[in-house]
């Protein structure tokens, strides 16, 4: 999947753009908003009717090296009595993010952007019947 | 910089950290093997904490379009379709990495940016705030 070039419908390419080899892009790894913090409600993963656990995946050749994945704890949802209600489904909510991967080929190093799907949490949904055509 | 290990057999010509500026292949590798958008496309409607999706577009960013979730109700939807205000619909937020064109308008020059997105909503039991 190639990154779309800036279309002329938006604006002209400025003269000040740095020269970049064909098929590549220049990427500054100094992150904008590096210290931004998630301000989610406290402990929602355990208070949710579709609770989840977190698993940390670690890869030193990836940035960010730490990616946190959620897994729904139950197949059903937790009712007011604290029991699992299987007439409802706990389902994962997912979000795509970019990661930067460093690849070693002998002593040379190349960099590749990857799209990774992160499971962020779970939500409780009403199932539907599969209507056969 | 971003700390990355080096192949120990290679000459010590690079910093232990990621270089501040790197050249990256324009092709983005897609690792999403076990997802199927048709399955999750209607969770926003079927959830007990349903949400609306708002389009956030910025041509200076890749991806240029990001969808933001906003919970429809303060409470959660019961089986009878009514809202139960003894429970709370809350957004699930996630930090994601995007590319920001830098300098502005340049087609192939970017900087990494962290942004916070609301991905969906979940129904939670409220916490009682005990005053000390």
């Amino acid at each position: 999947r190639k990154i779309p070039k800036v279309g002329h419908t938006f604006f002209q390419k400025p003269e000040s753009c740095p020269p970049v080899p064909e098929g590549s892009m220049k990427l500054d790894t100094g992150i904008i908003n590096e210290n931004q913090r998630v301000s989610m409600s406290r402990n929602i993963e355990s208070r949710s009717t579709s609770p989840w656990n977190y698993t940390v995946t670690w890869d030193p050749n990836r940035y960010p090296s730490e990616v946190v994945q959620a897994q729904c704890k139950h197949l059903g949802c937790i009712n007011a009595q604290g029991k699992e209600d299987i007439s409802m489904n706990s389902v994962p909510i997912q979000q795509e993010t970019l990661v930067l991967r460093r690849k070693h080929q002998g002593c040379s190093v190349s960099f590749q952007l990857e799209k990774v799907l992160v499971t962020v949490g779970c939500t409780c949904v009403t199932p539907v019947v599969h209507h056969v055509q | 910089g971003i700390a990355i290990p080096r192949n120990s057999g290679c000459p010590n010509s690079e910093d232990k950290n990621f270089p501040r500026t790197v050249m990256v292949n324009l092709n983005i590798h897609n690792r999403n093997t076990s997802t199927n958008p048709k399955r999750s496309s209607d969770y926003y409607n079927r959830s007990t904490s349903p949400w609306n999706l708002h389009r956030n577009e910025d041509p200076e960013r890749y991806p240029s379009v990001i969808w933001e979730a906003k919970c429809r109700h303060l409470g959660c939807v019961k089986a009878d379709g009514n809202v139960d205000y003894h429970m709370n619909s809350v957004p699930i937020q996630q930090e994601i990495l995007v590319l920001r064109r830098e300098p502005r308008h340049c087609p192939n020059s970017f900087r990494l940016e962290k942004i916070l997105v609301s991905v969906g909503c979940t129904c939670v039991t409220p916490i009682v705030h005990h005053v000390a």
Epitope: L75, I86, V125, H130, V132 | -
Partner: antibody, heavy 123, light 108 residues
């Protein structure tokens, strides 16, 4: 033709293992959650295990938890049940059943069944 | 665990008669109850789901009713092919898919 065909049953000694397979045809396999349901000779039905479309959701009956493992291979349109530490009370006809939930999710009703494969655990 | 009790264990009727089968749950399963038919040497077949919804291809003589703890499967006029064992099943609470012990409908 829409069908499920089980295989892999047979006579096995207590404590040993067996792997059941279910071949699905005539429908888009990964559009459905799948289950194993068993029936002891002359007895009623007992749900054993279920798995959603991408193996992200799996459940087991207490009677088999820790001994049986359900899995699926969507590329091969196949469902499996690995049965370890088999006991005499596992003797039954094992049915493969298709969940009627949409989007490969669980609905916990079974709209399509195979003919079953017989597992006999005896010394 | 929810226990489903079916009654009677055996129902002896003639073709053309009305059959009424009962399923009682040990606690409420709301409307999440299904009915299956099983003929000798065959796999079960789904008849009714969510207490009263007929599955695809099921004749109109089969109907289901009830909610909470008491449910009924009615066969308005028995056909020769309806003589079989009938099971109820809940999908309300864990463990899922618990079945009743069955009711055998036999020819009188």
């Amino acid at each position: 033709e829409v069908q499920l065909v089980e295989s892999g049953g047979g006579l096995v000694q207590p404590g040993r293992s067996l792997r059941l397979s279910c071949a699905a045809s005539g429908f888009t396999f990964d559009d459905y959650a799948m289950h194993w349901v068993r029936q002891a000779p002359g007895k009623g039905l007992e749900w054993v295990s279920g798995i959603n479309w991408n193996s992200g959701g799996i459940g087991y009956a207490d009677s088999v938890k820790g001994r049986f493992t359900i899995s699926r291979d969507n590329a091969k349109n196949s469902l499996y049940l690995q049965m370890n530490s088999l006991r005499a009370e596992d003797t039954a006809l094992y049915y493969c059943a298709r969940d009627m939930g949409g989007f490969g999710e669980f609905y916990w009703n079974f709209g399509l069944w195979g003919r079953g494969t017989l597992v006999t655990v005896s010394s | 665990e929810i226990v489903l009790t079916q009654s009677p264990a055996t129902l002896s009727l003639s073709p053309g008669e009305r059959a009424t089968l009962s399923c009682r749950a040990s606690q409420s399963v709301r409307s999440y109850l299904a009915w299956y038919q099983q003929k000798p040497g065959q796999a079960p077949r789904l008849l009714i789901y969510d207490a009263s919804n007929r599955a695809t291809g099921i004749p109109a003589r089969f109907s289901g009713s009830g909610s909470g703890t008491d449910f009924t499967l009615t066969i308005s006029s028995l056909e020769p092919e309806d003589f079989a064992v009938y099971y109820c099943q809940q999908r309300s609470n864990w463990p899922p898919a618990t079945f009743g012990g069955g009711t055998k409908v036999e020819i009188k």
